[in-house]
């Protein structure tokens, strides 16, 4: 699997999508994990709804909520309030019994945002919204490691 | 009606490379997994191997992986088992099987009728 | 690889008796789990999947109990055709394994 790169503003919401195919996975359940080190395990942040057919039905854990429309073969990762500390590689995966099959690898990046070094005396800051629903989503900017490419060049 | 057409037995010797195949009808063969299981004389079944014809992922038992080669050619509706070297221990019935995936569980539902491998000197 | 046991082998039933097979997984399987059935020089049949959903066209003597690491396929009142050997397979975990079978004969 190529990794796809999302880059999401701080204190935003990125949302990340995972195509999948369909029929290949029809009747699995779904799950966004984070990767702990380059061979570590990968640790479950959310899955989706338990029973298959609810899969479409919003789940979230803290700030990541997760949705999969199961025809269409989408599913989809919100992360809200985006913090430096969500930055790292994570896996969408599709779930059968005690095996976990990748859907596709994720390179999260968060940037800092530009507004932050402004005067925001002036600027109106709407309150955090309560709900995901309610939250206003960023388009993320995605794209896919070339091979042998390393994702956080060492600093000169 | 699903069908799956298995081809005909075979008699080779030891070393020799064989390929044998499951053609699917009556569905959307892109759409499920197919699996081989052997059966050799007079014993139980055993799990060799998965293909999924659509984008031709393949998993294998750890038992036949690097013994076999499974594969798929999704223009003809065809899975094929493959052996680059027979040895005298194939000798076996081999069955594919259409794997149906569902809210209430996975089942091996459509079977081949069985190609019977004969390997002897 | 989880390894599958049935017991017992061998059942002798007379035509009309209850038959009890025994499928018993080395670790939980939940309820991933099918039971197929095989007559001599035929391909297996499904029986049952999702450790207790029978197939299409399997009556309704053919049941299943348990679920986790021991499960049961009962026949309630066995027929001619139910003489034949039968087959546990576990799909939780790769790769899936089949039970060794247990034959039901006559009595």
């Known amino acids: 699997h190529n990794t796809t790169v999302f880059q999401g503003v701080e204190g935003q919401s990125l949302q990340v999508s995972c195509p999948y195919d369909s029929m290949k996975h029809w009747g699995r359940r779904k799950a966004w994990c984070r990767q702990l080190g380059e061979k570590g395990p990968c640790q479950r942040v959310v899955s989706t709804h338990n029973l298959w057919l609810l899969s479409f039905l919003r789940r979230r854990n803290g700030s990541t909520a997760i949705t999969d429309d199961t025809l269409g073969g989408t599913l989809t990762i919100t992360l809200r309030n985006l913090q430096p500390h969500d930055a790292g590689f994570y896996q969408c995966q599709s779930l059968h019994g005690s095996e976990a099959d990748t859907l596709r690898k994720v390179l999260v990046e968060v940037l800092a945002d530009p507004l932050d070094h402004r005067d925001a005396g002036d600027l109106w800051v709407p309150g955090e919204s309560e709900s995901f629903e309610d939250a206003h989503v960023e388009h993320s900017i995605s794209r896919s490691l070339l091979e042998g490419e390393i994702p956080f060049p060492p600093t000169s | 009606e699903v069908q799956l057409v298995q081809s005909g037995a075979e008699v080779k010797k030891p070393g020799e490379s064989l390929m044998i195949s499951c053609k699917g009808s009556?569905?959307?063969?892109?759409?499920?997994?197919i699996g081989w299981v052997r059966q050799m004389p007079g014993k139980g079944l055993e799990w060799m191997g998965i293909?999924?014809?659509?984008?031709?992922?393949?998993r294998y038992s750890p038992s036949f992986q690097g013994q076999v080669t499974i594969s798929a050619d999704k223009s003809i509706s065809t899975a094929y088992l493959q052996w680059s070297s027979l040895k005298a221990s194939d000798t076996a019935m081999y069955f594919c099987?259409?794997?149906?995936?569902?809210?209430?569980?996975?089942?091996?539902?459509?079977w081949g009728q069985g190609t019977l491998v004969t390997v002897s000197s | 690889e989880i390894v599958m046991t049935q017991s017992p082998a061998t059942l002798s039933v007379s035509p009309g008796e209850r038959a009890t097979l025994s499928c018993r997984a080395s670790?939980?399987?939940?309820?991933?789990l099918a039971w197929f059935q095989q007559k001599p020089g035929q391909a297996p049949r499904l029986l049952i999947y999702?450790?207790?959903t029978r197939a299409t066209g399997i009556p309704a003597r053919f049941s299943v109990s348990g679920s986790g690491t021991e499960f049961t396929l009962t026949i309630s009142s066995l027929q001619s055709e139910d003489f034949a050997v039968y087959y546990c397979?576990?799909?939780?975990?790769?790769?899936?394994?089949f039970g060794p079978g247990t034959k039901v004969d006559i009595k």
């Open positions: 099987a259409r794997r149906r995936q569902g809210i209430w569980g996975d089942a091996l539902d459509f």
């Open positions: 009556g569905y959307s063969f892109t759409s499920y997994w």
């Open positions: 293909i999924y014809p659509g984008d031709s992922d393949t």
């Open positions: 670790q939980s399987v939940s309820s991933n």
């Open positions: 999702g450790a207790s």
């Open positions: 397979l576990q799909d939780n975990n790769w790769p899936p394994t």
